[in-house]
Interface confidence: low
């Protein structure tokens, strides 16, 4: 029986401008960390992004992070091979820990991780692991973002060079060079075991200031399968004190998580003190609102092949630019809804423009996972007007996922709307 | 072929509010920066402000609080403008940038031009 | 504020070579584009990025710059290039955005 229903976005399509929406942040007003004499900031309120140059004056430059990365004019640069890494497939030691900054979940890596190539000026090793995520129901949290598109979760990692500095804080407080890879994490039906010791370690960190030691995790798994496919582009740290010294490794190819992964970002704690009164308060949405590109261009990797075999579906320009082999944007306003015990009704609402017009039809599909395996169907609605589908035989124990993709004349495709995750025979989520 | 079309300009008695309307062929303005550039008569060019591919809008000081950009569709672009004087008599353009990958003020379609006069 | 400096005037002889001159503190840091006006006709862009000129557009254009200032250079000026001149730049940190006018040189193409 279908007790209850539960729909949502898989993936949030929002461009830049919905940035500043749903940020669920608490008042801050601390004026100075306690411990230390760096500048106190926020995510929102008083100490917000909005304010951050103020206290930091980098964080009003010309060359700061995150940013918007558009494909279609990410120039080839033939410099930018493949990446080596060095140490990435060994098993972590045990003296490697995460801690709830309050600001992120970090962990701190205690092995040798060297990445080397990608127009890197050395050497580089992984100091820490930095997460940034939103707010609830894989809605969009991260901050780089690929022709528009953001995602749930955004794993950075950052490195040094340790050939000219004994230390990461060290690189920061001189103002050199740094790297940093970004990896963005895509709502997927099952959970990625290779998360596992993340997500267990995040359940051990939940409130903030906790510490945990993690269990043994391979870096190179948190990573994306292909690492073929990346943009380069010189940013800054995405937090205070912004510093403009960043060479940014943005992974085009997301990795899998699991809603039910999900949800241990979201159960996250942070502490806020207003004057005299700390309170406790969810850390979600700790992303920093993009930033212009002004005057810099965005490169992407030569590496033979890398871009051809991509998960184009996900990230295809939502943008329908005039360039774009799209005919039409995205079908929009997509909604799942029961229509009685075994069966559903998908709908959504004609592309908003059609470049390459008439559509002729709309193709629907669908993914689900029971009893650990995957399953996909696809159909045609031969219809552009009657704008909905109904999936019978439903299953009340699986999660299903929904796409709808206008097809035109030629075989021509538009975008694939919004992914649509459902869940039945759900109390809560 | 790309172009750009104003429209709505007319004669208006100051405190009349109005809105321009820019009309984009052969492109999609959700990945450009649009921009709305004035000429009062026998003077220079002067920049009022931008919207950009997310929807994100800029404007130049004076013209924060009586000038208002937003993105109607993928084809058209408003300026809406509230509080008119004399002083706002002028040819209205819009103009796209050159390439969306960066913004260095390299506006390399415009379009002809639309004429507000402000006038009692 | 950010304010982009071009001589009210310029004179050139037809076929000789001239150049207009945009200049402003910090424009080092900046690039610039420049646009040619002619009397009831939209701008047209003639160089951006300092140095680079869209399609379409003479190779009798060039523009260049150094330190706070930027040139445009119109060689073997022709009756046709007789216009109003703008060099134009950006202004603004991180997230805040101006794009900023000079007040523009008005050509005149003698002989």
């Known amino acids: 029986v279908l007790h209850y229903v539960v729909c949502f976005p898989a993936l949030t399509e929002g461009y830049v401008g919905a940035l500043h929406e749903n940020r669920h942040g608490s008042a801050v007003q601390i004026r100075r960390r306690k411990a230390s004499g760096d500048p106190y900031w926020a995510y929102s309120g008083a100490y917000g992004p909005e304010h951050w140059v103020t206290s930091s004056v980098s964080c009003g430059g010309r060359h700061q992070s995150p940013i918007d990365i558009l494909d279609q004019y990410a120039r080839v640069g033939e410099e930018y091979q493949e990446l080596q890494l060095d140490g990435f497939d060994n098993e972590s030691s045990n003296k490697t820990w995460m801690k709830n900054t309050g600001k992120t979940v970090a962990i701190l890596l205690k092995d040798d991780y060297f990445v080397s190539g990608a127009g890197l000026p050395g050497r580089f090793k992984a100091e820490k692991v930095e997460f940034h995520w939103g707010h609830s129901n894989g809605s969009a949290g991260s901050e780089h973002s690929i022709n528009g598109r953001r995602f749930p979760v955004e794993m950075q990692i950052f490195f040094y060079n340790p050939d000219d500095f004994d230390s990461f804080q060290t690189a920061i407080s001189e103002n050199r060079i740094i790297g940093a890879m970004a990896i963005f994490f895509q709502v997927s039906p099952r959970d990625n075991s290779a998360l596992d010791p993340i997500i267990h370690g995040l359940k051990g960190v939940v409130h903030h200031e906790k510490e945990t030691f993690l269990d043994p995790f391979v870096l190179r798994d948190l990573l994306p399968a292909s690492l073929g496919s990346y943009y380069r582009y010189t940013g800054s740290l995405t937090t205070p004190p912004c510093s403009e010294i960043v060479e940014w490794i943005v992974f085009r190819r997301p990795v899998p998580i699991s809603y039910h992964q999900l949800e241990a970002f979201y159960s996250i704690f942070t502490t806020e003190q207003q004057d005299h009164v700390k309170s406790v308060e969810y850390l979600r949405n700790n992303f920093r609102p993009q930033q212009r590109l002004h005057d810099r261009v965005v490169s992407k990797s030569a590496v033979r092949d890398s871009w051809n075999h991509d998960m184009t579906d996900f990230l295809e320009n939502p943008l329908g630019t005039e360039a774009s082999k799209v005919c039409s944007s995205p079908p929009i306003h997509m909604k799942v809804q029961p229509l009685n015990q075994t069966a559903l009704q998908v709908s959504w609402s004609q592309p908003e423009t059609i470049y390459h017009p008439p559509i002729m039809n709309y193709m629907i599909s669908y993914s689900w996972t029971k009893n650990e395996d995957e399953k996909e169907k696809t159909f045609t609605k031969d219809s552009d007007k009657d704008l909905k589908a109904t999936i019978s035989h439903v299953s009340p124990d699986s999660l299903y996922l929904f796409r709808v993709q206008a097809v035109c004349r030629n075989d021509m495709r538009s975008d694939f709307s919004q992914t649509m995750l459902f869940q039945a025979n759900t109390t809560r989520i | 072929a790309q172009s750009l079309e104003e429209s709505g300009g007319r004669l208006v008695t100051p405190g009349t509010p109005l809105t321009l309307t820019c009309t984009a062929s052969?492109?999609?303005?959700?990945?450009?920066?649009m921009s709305w550039v004035r000429q009062a008569p026998g003077k220079g060019l002067e920049w009022i402000g931008l919207?950009?591919?997310?929807?994100?809008t800029y404007y130049a000081s004076w013209a924060k609080g009586r000038f208002t950009i937003s993105k109607t569709s993928s084809t058209t672009v408003d300026l809406k403008m509230t509080s008119l004087t004399t002083e706002d008599t002028a040819t209205y353009f819009c103009?796209?940038?050159?390439?969306?990958?960066?913004?260095?003020?390299?506006?390399?379609?415009w379009g002809p031009g639309t004429l507000v006069t402000i006038s009692s | 504020s950010f304010v982009l400096t071009q001589p009210a005037s310029v004179q050139v002889n037809l076929g000789q070579t001239v150049s207009l001159t945009c200049t402003a503190d910090?424009?080092?840091?900046?690039?610039a584009s420049w646009y040619q006006q002619k009397p009831g006709q939209a701008p047209v862009l003639l160089i951006y990025?300092?140095?680079r000129r869209p399609s379409g557009v003479p190779d009798r254009f060039s523009g260049s710059s150094s330190g706070n200032t930027a040139t445009l250079t119109i060689s073997g000026a022709q009756a046709g290039d007789e216009a109003d001149y703008y060099c134009?730049?950006?202004?603004?940190?991180?997230?805040?955005?101006?794009?900023?006018f000079g007040g523009g040189t008005q050509l005149t193409v003698t002989g």
């Open positions: 919207i950009d591919g997310g929807g994100n």
């Open positions: 910090t424009l080092s840091r900046r690039y």
């Open positions: 990025r300092d140095t």
């Open positions: 134009v730049t950006t202004d603004g940190s991180g997230s805040s955005y101006l794009v900023v």
């Open positions: 103009a796209r940038e050159l390439w969306p990958a960066y913004s260095s003020g390299a506006f390399n379609i």
């Open positions: 052969g492109f999609s303005l959700y990945s450009y920066d």
